[in-house]
């Protein structure tokens, strides 16, 4: 009788991560008596995948009923394949022995290749806000894909960026890979509504490339411009001084009025007007009773925006032309409900 052969018909198979892999193995004879075992890898460090006689292998099922007397099919199915399952699998026939079974013959092996999709790209920006004209870095990361080939592109508002560096790790062979890219973006005053997009394309993706986004509204700080102006009011001896705070982002803003260096009133910006570009305007006004002042008054509008050092704009109020009224006080008015967009 011809000597038993272990036949693994598939030299290689490829499986998508999450699917099942069927590893085929048949023997040509029932003799010698003894079990079949499946291993990943060869040599002393090989990993036992399935033992016909003993052990618990929750992800492995046999394709045919091994308890049947004349069974010669020892194919197995491994469920929920991950990239870590990649490797060469050997179907090995053992001869019954005492106390241990003796390896009799091995199949030629089946190489299992696993294709896995990249994870959704995650884009992260700088920890601190930056102002227009500054260059900021964004990073994009995606993990767990196989094979290694992958393309990554950066876009700002649909326009492809060219200033970026990308690495795919590890450099050598691995069961799965990660990609890391850093892009440099120059901020402009119009970037409040802008988006930075990282786009990853891979052979496993049936749809369009995967995209990760970052909103520049979380990165940019647009400092305000200030303008202090004076308007007469109907009531004699009263002057309305307004401070227009224009084109700032984010909203967090505190305004202080100073009269000759002394704090007159502090208020926090509440009802803001949003501009088309996403920045905000705000207007505060101060009603000054000029008869309360003998000398000219220096009015200062001081703005602290988003925790940054204060910026200010001053206005000299000439009082010499007005008749003096003893004992009257400065009457600060409330901030206007809204300011017209510029």
């Amino acid at each position: 009788e011809e000597e038993l052969q272990v036949i693994q018909p598939d030299k290689s198979i490829s499986v998508a991560a999450g699917e099942s892999a069927t590893l085929h193995c048949t023997v040509t004879s029932l003799i010698p008596v003894g079990p079949i075992q499946w291993f990943r890898g060869a040599g002393p460090g090989r990993e036992l995948i399935y033992n016909q006689k003993e052990g618990h292998f929750p992800r492995v099922t046999t394709v045919s009923d091994l308890t049947k007397r004349n069974n010669m099919d020892f194919s197995i199915r491994i469920s929920n394949i991950t990239p870590a399952d990649a490797g060469t699998y050997y179907c090995v026939k053992f001869r019954k022995g005492s106390p241990d079974h003796v390896e009799f013959k091995s199949g030629a092996g089946t190489e299992l290749s696993v294709r896995a999709k990249p994870s959704a790209p995650v884009v992260s920006g700088p920890a601190a806000r930056a102002t227009p004209q500054h260059t900021v870095s964004f990073t994009c990361e995606s993990h767990g894909f196989s094979p290694r080939d992958i393309t990554l592109k950066w876009f700002k508002n649909g326009n492809e960026l060219s200033d970026f560096q990308t690495n795919v790790d590890p450099a050598g062979d691995s069961v799965s890979y990660s990609i890391h890219s850093t892009a440099k973006v120059v901020l402009t005053r119009e970037d409040v509504h802008s988006q930075v997009i990282c786009e990853v394309a891979h052979v496993t993706l049936q749809g369009d490339p995967l995209r990760g986004t970052a909103n520049l509204s979380e990165t940019i700080r647009v400092p305000p411009t200030l303008e202090v102006t004076q308007q007469p009011v109907r009531a004699e001896n009263q002057v309305n001084v307004t401070c227009q705070v224009r084109k700032f982002y984010p909203q967090r803003l505190q305004l202080t009025w100073l009269e000759n260096g002394n704090v007159s009133r502090t208020e926090t910006a509440s009802t803001l007007t949003e501009n088309k570009d996403g920045t905000y305007n705000w207007m505060s006004w101060l009603l000054v009773n000029v008869s309360a002042h003998r000398d000219d008054v220096k009015l200062t509008c001081q703005v602290e925006h988003d925790g940054q050092p204060a910026v200010s704009k001053s206005h000299d109020l000439k009082v010499s032309a007005h008749p003096k009224e003893q004992g009257s006080n400065t009457a600060p008015g409330p901030a206007l409900a809204s300011a017209a967009p510029l």
Epitope: V15, A16, P147, D149, T151, A201, V203, T204, D208
Partner: antibody, heavy 116, light 109 residues
Framework: VQLVESGGRLGQPGTSLTLSCTVS????????MGWFRQAPGKGLEYIGI?????SPYYASWVNGRFTISKTSTTMDLKMNSLRSEDTATYFC?????????????WGPGTLVTVSS | DIQMTQSPSSLSASVGDRVTITCRAS??????LAWYQQKPGKAPKLLIY???FLYSGVPSRFSGSGSGTDFTLTISSLQPEDFATYYC???????????FGQGTKVEIK
């Protein structure tokens, strides 16, 4: 799983023609689909694909003359400004479940003849 | 665009012969190469994908090898039903585009 092309016929140069690929046994929203053609006695030529989400991508030679679109069960190829060199059998195909680098299911093809 | 050069363009062989068809890419396509069989008046049929993986239901006499730019389709023992035209097809992962070789017609000697 089946693909069937339709719409192939004799067309005049300069006119337009729309071919359809009707699928059964799977969802078009899960796979990339492609259009190919083969002129009589010649080799296979790639025209374009449409992604599972509906974005089309074309071979560089197409130059806007062909448009690929899809509904829930059909994928269409609209051909404008027909030329005699567009005479071919047109095939639709589905990419494999493991990735977009190969096509494992093909329709039988539909013949387009462009002649005056 | 990538060019795929297939050779020979035709060959004559007998049943039982070992047949080898080669395909060369103008630039590296790693292992993104498929082989198809086409018979007259029929649609192409997938034989091999990812350069070396046998598609389900395809007889084991068909095998593929190669990576980078040079690829081979081998039929170990030609059968009567194997007389057909064979095409290689590449996919380029950067341009995400497909290119076919010009075909190899396998005829009966």
């Amino acid at each position: 799983v089946q693909l069937v092309e339709s719409g192939g016929r004799l067309g005049q140069p300069g006119t337009s023609l729309t071919l359809s690929c009707t699928v059964s046994g799977f969802s078009l929203s899960s796979y990339v689909m492609g259009w190919f053609r083969q002129a009589p006695g010649k080799g296979l030529e790639y025209i374009g694909i449409i992604s599972s989400s509906g974005s089309p991508y074309y071979a560089s030679w197409v130059n806007g003359r062909f448009t690929i679109s899809k509904t829930s069960t059909t994928m269409d190829l609209k051909m404008n400004s027909l030329r005699s060199e567009d005479t071919a059998t047109y095939f639709c195909a589905r990419v494999g479940p493991l990735g977009v680098d190969y096509f494992n299911i093909w329709g039988p093809g539909t013949l387009v003849t462009v002649s005056s | 665009d990538i060019q795929m050069t297939q050779s020979p363009s035709s060959l004559s062989a007998s049943v039982g012969d070992r047949v080898t068809i080669t395909c060369r890419a103008s630039q590296s396509i790693n292992s993104y190469l498929a082989w198809y069989q086409q018979k007259p008046g029929k649609a192409p049929k997938l034989l091999i994908y990812s350069a070396s993986f046998l598609y389900s239901g395809v007889p084991s006499r068909f095998s593929g090898s190669g990576s980078g730019t040079d690829f081979t389709l081998t039929i170990s023992s030609l059968q009567p039903e194997d007389f057909a035209t064979y095409y290689c097809q590449s996919w380029h992962y950067i341009s995400r585009s497909y290119t076919f070789g010009q075909g190899t017609k396998v005829e009966i000697k």
